[in-house]
């Protein structure tokens, strides 16, 4: 790499993948290794992710561009930019500080991440239960009482004494 | 670079806002910027992260939760630190770092500023 | 939390020397750990990252190794720019509840 020429700022002319090197009378030196620069003009090379562990590579490191990480199969990401990877756990199930725990009854999670989360309660909107709720699945809403042929019974759940539950992260 | 400001003398129980500008590199960017401190003579305290992506994510160091907190404003490229309840144990040069490696590791810094919490 | 542990916390070493400075981890964080090297009145300057990675600008006579919980600076030949305080620091973003980010206590490399 040539040594750069501007009249202005000598680093200005440092492209993409270089750094502008002060102890070598500011020539443009590439990036070293796990390391880049996404903009011209650096005098520092940024330092590429690594996807270790439960993390997983999506992109790698070029030297004019950072790393993007995912997790690997049984976790999801969380955070920015993927940050962290958290547990993945079955539907019906939540996350705590000692793994994976069925959801209480009264509660649900139709995903493998998050919290479980209180039934609705159909009484609420003046509606009765149609279909009955279960750790995987909310209950289904139909009509309310008073819409219902005489003799047809409903099953409306008391709500759940519970404050929903918190995952740990 | 990163430059910090802000800094100045403040009562025990006061408050005061740091701020870091950015140049030469986008806050869109997907960047980590931290504030890290030193007080007279001592070492170096990692006290909050943000992330200066899209999603802003927070962390505290437990010596900075419930006082102080971390934000961003994108279009003016500038991180703030607004300490609350402030006391004697909080002087210390307050510096900016960045990170792009997800792991605390600051290629970046600032020049710093210094706070001094005395009566 | 994370806690490293820097020694020793000060050395006294002559132009030329090899020098080491050590840093432990309290629990493994593989290899998530950089050294830092600072002057009075001046903010720190990054010379290794991911235990062993030389960052740009830095001259090679810094080296860094180890992983787990054990990690060494060395500096092959000290130089009269050379004495400063070291610092390590170790890492990585788990949750808002249970973030770890420590430094260790620092390392004064001063003139024998």
């Known amino acids: 790499f040539e040594r750069t020429r501007s009249l202005q700022d000598p680093c200005s002319n440092c492209p993409a993948g270089t750094f502008c090197d002060n102890n070598r009378n500011q020539i443009c030196s590439p990036c070293p290794p796990n390391s880049f620069s996404s903009a011209g003009g650096q005098r520092t090379c940024d330092i590429c992710r690594q996807c270790k562990g439960v993390f997983r590579t999506r992109k790698e490191c070029s030297s004019t561009s950072n790393a993007e990480c995912d997790c690997t199969p049984g976790f999801h990401c969380l955070g920015a930019g993927c940050s962290m990877c958290e547990q993945d756990c079955k539907q019906g199930q939540e996350l705590t500080k000692k793994g994976c725990k069925d959801c209480c009854f009264g509660t649900f999670n139709d995903q493998k991440r998050g919290i479980c989360r209180p039934w609705t309660n159909c009484s609420l909107d003046g509606k009765s239960v149609l279909v009955n709720g279960t750790k995987e699945r909310d209950v289904v809403c139909g009509p309310s009482p008073a819409d219902l042929s005489p003799g047809a019974s409903s099953v409306t759940p008391p709500a759940p004494a519970r404050e929903p539950g918190h995952s740990p992260q | 670079s990163l430059v910090e400001s802000g800094g100045g003398l403040v009562q025990p129980g006061g408050s005061l806002r740091l701020s870091c500008a950015a140049s030469?590199?986008?806050?869109?960017?997907?960047?980590?910027i931290c504030w890290v401190r030193q007080a007279p003579g001592k070492g170096l305290e990692w006290i909050a992260c943000?992330?200066?992506?899209?999603?802003?994510?927070?962390y505290y160091a437990s010596s900075a939760k419930g006082r102080f907190t971390i934000s961003r404003d994108n279009s003016k490229n500038t991180l703030y630190l607004q300490m609350n309840s402030l006391r004697a144990e909080d002087t210390a040069v307050y510096y900016c770092?960045?990170?792009?490696?997800?792991?605390?590791?600051?290629?970046?810094w600032g020049q710093g500023t210094l706070v001094t919490v005395s009566s | 939390a994370l806690v490293m542990t820097q020694s020793p916390s000060t050395l006294s070493a002559s132009v030329g020397d090899r020098v080491t400075i050590n840093c432990q981890a309290s629990?493994?964080?593989?290899?998530?750990l950089a050294w830092y090297q600072q002057k009075p009145g001046k903010a720190p300057k990054l010379l290794i990252f991911?235990?062993?990675d030389l960052a740009s600008g830095v001259p090679s006579r810094f080296s860094g190794s180890g992983s787990g919980t054990e990690f060494t600076l060395t500096i092959s030949s000290l130089q009269p720019d050379d004495f400063a305080t070291y610092y390590c620091?170790?890492?990585?973003?788990?949750?808002?509840?249970?973030?770890?980010?420590?430094f260790g206590g620092g390392t004064k490399v001063e003139i024998k």
């Open positions: 943000i992330y200066v992506g899209s999603s802003g994510d927070t």
């Open positions: 620091q170790g890492g990585y973003y788990t949750s808002s509840a249970d973030t770890r980010g420590a």
């Open positions: 030469g590199f986008s806050f869109s960017s997907n960047y980590w």
């Open positions: 629990e493994d964080i593989d290899t998530y």
């Open positions: 991911y235990a062993s």
């Open positions: 770092a960045r990170d792009s490696s997800s792991y605390y590791m600051f290629n970046l």
